[in-house]
């Protein structure tokens, strides 16, 4: 019989109200043995996966998703879900990220949610986490 998977938890560091241009890290936590953590936003419409999972305690694992420079488009509802083979867990509760104007900060009216949320272990200069979708035309990326 498959084990019942506990719901994950979600938190944000340093908090859920972030000045424009500042950084925020979402922390997803679940049981040990998690293979993939997924940070979903806005009712499953988009998500970001990572398998860069660390052990937070003897009974918990976690993954951290960092947005280096928060934009207005990053505001919204976020939640976590995890994959512990052979199945996905239920979703965590929602966490709402609010972005507040910092005086003199650049206006950022993007409608597409920023995609720079990635595990803190990842470099931040890769197309996987940049705001624009990766395009073969932008870099000489090939598979052969």
């Amino acid at each position: 019989q498959e084990e019942d998977l506990p719901r994950p938890s979600i938190s944000a560091e340093p908090g859920t109200v972030i000045p424009l241009g500042s950084h925020v890290t979402f922390v997803c936590r679940g049981p040990v043995g998690v293979q993939t953590f997924r940070l979903e936003r806005d009712s499953r419409s988009t998500y970001n996966d990572t398998e860069d999972v660390s052990q937070a305690s003897p009974s918990e694992s976690e993954a951290r998703f960092r947005i280096d420079s928060v934009r207005e488009g990053n505001a919204g509802l976020y939640r976590c879900i995890y994959y512990k083979p052979p199945k996905w867990s239920e979703q965590s509760d929602y966490l709402e990220l609010l972005v507040k104007e910092s005086s003199g900060g650049p206006d950022s009216p993007d409608t597409e949610p920023g995609s720079s949320a990635g595990p803190t272990q990842r470099p931040s200069d890769n197309s996987h986490n940049e705001h624009a979708p990766a395009s073969q035309g932008l870099k000489a990326e090939h598979l052969y």
Partner: antibody, heavy 117, light 108 residues
Framework: ESGGGLVQPEGSLTLTCTAS?????????MCWVRQAPGKGLEWIGC????????TYYASWAEGRFTISKTPSTTVTLQMTSLTAADTATYFC??????????????WGPGTLVTVSS | ELVLTQTPASVEAAVGGTVTIKCQAS??????LAWYQQKPGQPPKVLIY???TLASGVPSRFKGSGSGTEFTLTISDLECADAATYYC??????????FGGGTEVVVK
Amino acid sequence: ESGGGLVQPEGSLTLTCTASGFSFSNSYYMCWVRQAPGKGLEWIGCIYTGSSSGTYYASWAEGRFTISKTPSTTVTLQMTSLTAADTATYFCSRKLTNFNGAYLDLWGPGTLVTVSS
Amino acid sequence: ELVLTQTPASVEAAVGGTVTIKCQASQSIYSYLAWYQQKPGQPPKVLIYKASTLASGVPSRFKGSGSGTEFTLTISDLECADAATYYCQNNNGGSDNTFGGGTEVVVK
């Protein structure tokens, strides 16, 4: 992709995919997809290029197909107990999963595997 | 196991016309669907991801819609260059990366 060619029934073959212009340290999924002559696309499986190297397979591929990677830029597909039904062009592709969506954004040209005696 | 059913298997339309391709999932996949175009002898190319978001460099004549179990790809103002086979794919992760059976578009 490389390593394709003619192989005997019940034989084995390993295909190799090499990435250029991006690094596996950025934690992508690298996937294999195949296409039999005149048929549709069939997903085989993916491997995560980050530290966990987690693998995922289509149910039909589990056991006979093994995906692995080197730390830098190479992914392999090991195939065993091949039959004529495995004759296909095998594509390597990169899967993005981020807030812009999830999709296979980069593809190799494909390598043909023919299983015949 | 998830199944994606694409209809029709083949469709023919005139230059300047409109083609609609449907993709039905056997269970909800939310918005985790991408559409690809493949021409003979070439690897597929992504057109639409997240069910309705146009990939970089793809003309706005291509439109994706739907969520849950019902998805549609609409190609308007057909051009000869649109003659190809089109595939939908679930991208939910885990072992759910299934492709639909494909739809061949013939442009007259």
